[in-house]
């Protein structure tokens, strides 16, 4: 490590050509963890380029990534999950650029699934529920969820609600009547683990009922 440039500008210049980013997924396949890396520049010629991770591993010094089209991938049980790993882009055994990364700070959860919305006529509300595989996991169990919904005709006017549970109630009075809504949800690690938003769940579509006022009844 002692051979690295100490000047900040030189340091970043060294990374420019082969800048890459990575995310980890813990217990993504049983007790196996995964690490996925890709170059920031999609035009990088990846022929002969390899990725390797060294340090903060169990029983081995280094592991090589598999290449799957334009991404580089490892699935293993051998992440120590404490301390920093050195992830390097290599060509012919020579390192072109490296990053020290703590795998617990680049966690990307799996996308939530089974999103559904049920209208409760008596309560005049919509109960939003969804599921996450992380309820069964032993490491990244605590997540923050971002539920986003919009009226289908308002292309970029998303409303967001952050919550830690997998159930949300939307009041009918806060939604437009007789409108089609799209809703989706994603997750990010909370409590110790850090990282990135998951992919969005598949969208769910629901229609709000018309306002049905009885004679003499006030608008809600």
């Amino acid at each position: 490590e002692s051979g690295y440039a100490q000047n900040g500008d030189l340091e970043d210049a060294e990374l420019d050509d082969y800048s890459f980013s990575c995310y980890s997924q813990l217990e993504v396949n049983g007790s196996q963890h995964s690490l996925t890396c890709a170059f920031e520049d999609p035009d990088v010629n990846t022929t002969n380029l390899e990725f390797e991770i060294c340090g903060a591993l169990v029983e081995v010094k280094c592991l090589s990534f598999r290449k799957l089209q334009e991404i580089y991938f490892i699935e293993t049980k051998k992440f120590l999950l404490i301390g920093k790993s050195n992830i390097c882009v290599k060509v012919g055994g020579k390192s072109l650029t490296c990053k020290k990364i703590d795998l617990t700070t680049i966690v990307k959860p799996e996308a939530p699934f089974d999103l559904s919305v049920i209208y409760r006529e008596g309560a005049n509300d919509f109960v939003v529920t969804f599921n996450t595989s992380h309820l069964q996991k032993k490491y990244v169990k605590v997540l923050m969820h971002d539920v986003a919904y919009r009226q289908e005709k308002d292309e970029n006017k998303w409303m967001h609600v952050n919550l830690s549970s997998t159930k949300l109630t939307l009041l009918q009075r806060n939604l437009q009547p007789e409108a089609m809504y799209e809703i989706k949800v994603r997750s990010i690690p909370d409590h110790y683990f850090k990282g990135f938003w998951s992919e969005w769940s598949p969208s769910y579509y629901f229609r709000t009922p018309e306002i049905n006022n009885s004679p003499g009844e006030m608008d809600p």
């Epitope: 340091e11 404490i82 301390g83 920093k84 032993k138 490491y139 110790y192």
Partner: antibody, heavy 118, light 111 residues
């Protein structure tokens, strides 16, 4: 080899400020967060806060917020801890320490003694 | 804040014997098999030195007579066999939750 070298001892009057430096060498400065730990005379260790030299992002022990400001200078691979409104209870040895992981400290500076006395 | 309680506060051990220090936390510092407990040695006039990280991982360059174990709220540092140069204060530290707190220390003396 990996080293953290801190500035020399300081004697300050109550109400004054002091800025302690910690110069890193032997590794790429932006690869590791640097933290500060207080040790009052005859006492144990107390985490003050840390800084990520790559981003300048800081984390502080709530107890030291308003008392301590952490900064870093990538051009000289140096981090700084400024203590303000000094009081006698700030008399201590202050250590900078590199975080080898979240958040344990694998390399320590030699310590800087700050004495607050009228 | 998570409180770390070390015991004993001090102990005297003969060379070649085993020294055991315990650290109990006010709440769990483990996430499954990830145990966020670390141990340091501090000799008079010197900065602390990392011995064990993640409850049981020996820091590079630290003699194998130092070992760590434990999970959740109960952790142990063992020195076996103790040598004269092990006279020092020993501290545990948790890193699951900010602020990252240390135990009060255990003073180990060699008889």
């Amino acid at each position: 080899q990996v080293q953290l070298v801190q500035s020399g001892a300081e004697v300050k009057k109550p109400g004054a400020s002091v800025k302690v430096s910690c110069k890193a060498s032997g590794y790429r400065f932006t690869d590791y967060e640097l933290h500060w730990v207080k040790q009052a005379p005859g006492q144990g260790l107390e985490w003050i806060g840390g800084i990520d030299p790559k981003t300048g992002g800081t984390a502080y022990n709530q107890k030291f917020k308003g008392k301590v400001t952490l900064t870093s200078d990538r051009s000289t691979s140096t981090v700084y801890m400024e203590l303000s409104s000094l009081r006698s209870e700030d008399t201590a040895v202050y250590y900078c320490a590199r975080s080898g992981g979240r958040w344990y400290f694998d390399v320590w500076g030699q310590g800087t003694t700050v004495t607050v006395s009228s | 804040d998570i409180v770390l309680t070390q015991s004993p506060a001090s102990l005297a051990v003969s060379p070649g014997q085993r020294a055991t220090i315990t650290c109990r936390t006010s709440e769990s510092v483990s996430i499954h098999l990830l145990h966020l407990m670390h141990w340091y040695q501090q000799k008079p006039g010197q900065p602390p030195k990392l011995l064990i990280y993640g409850a049981s991982n020996l820091e590079s360059g630290v003699p194998a007579r130092f070992s760590g174990s434990g999970s959740e709220t109960d952790f142990t540092l063992t020195i076996n066999p103790v040598e004269a140069e092990d006279t020092a204060n020993y501290y545990c530290q948790q890193s699951i939750k900010d602020p990252y707190t240390f135990g009060g220390g255990t003073k180990v003396e060699i008889k």
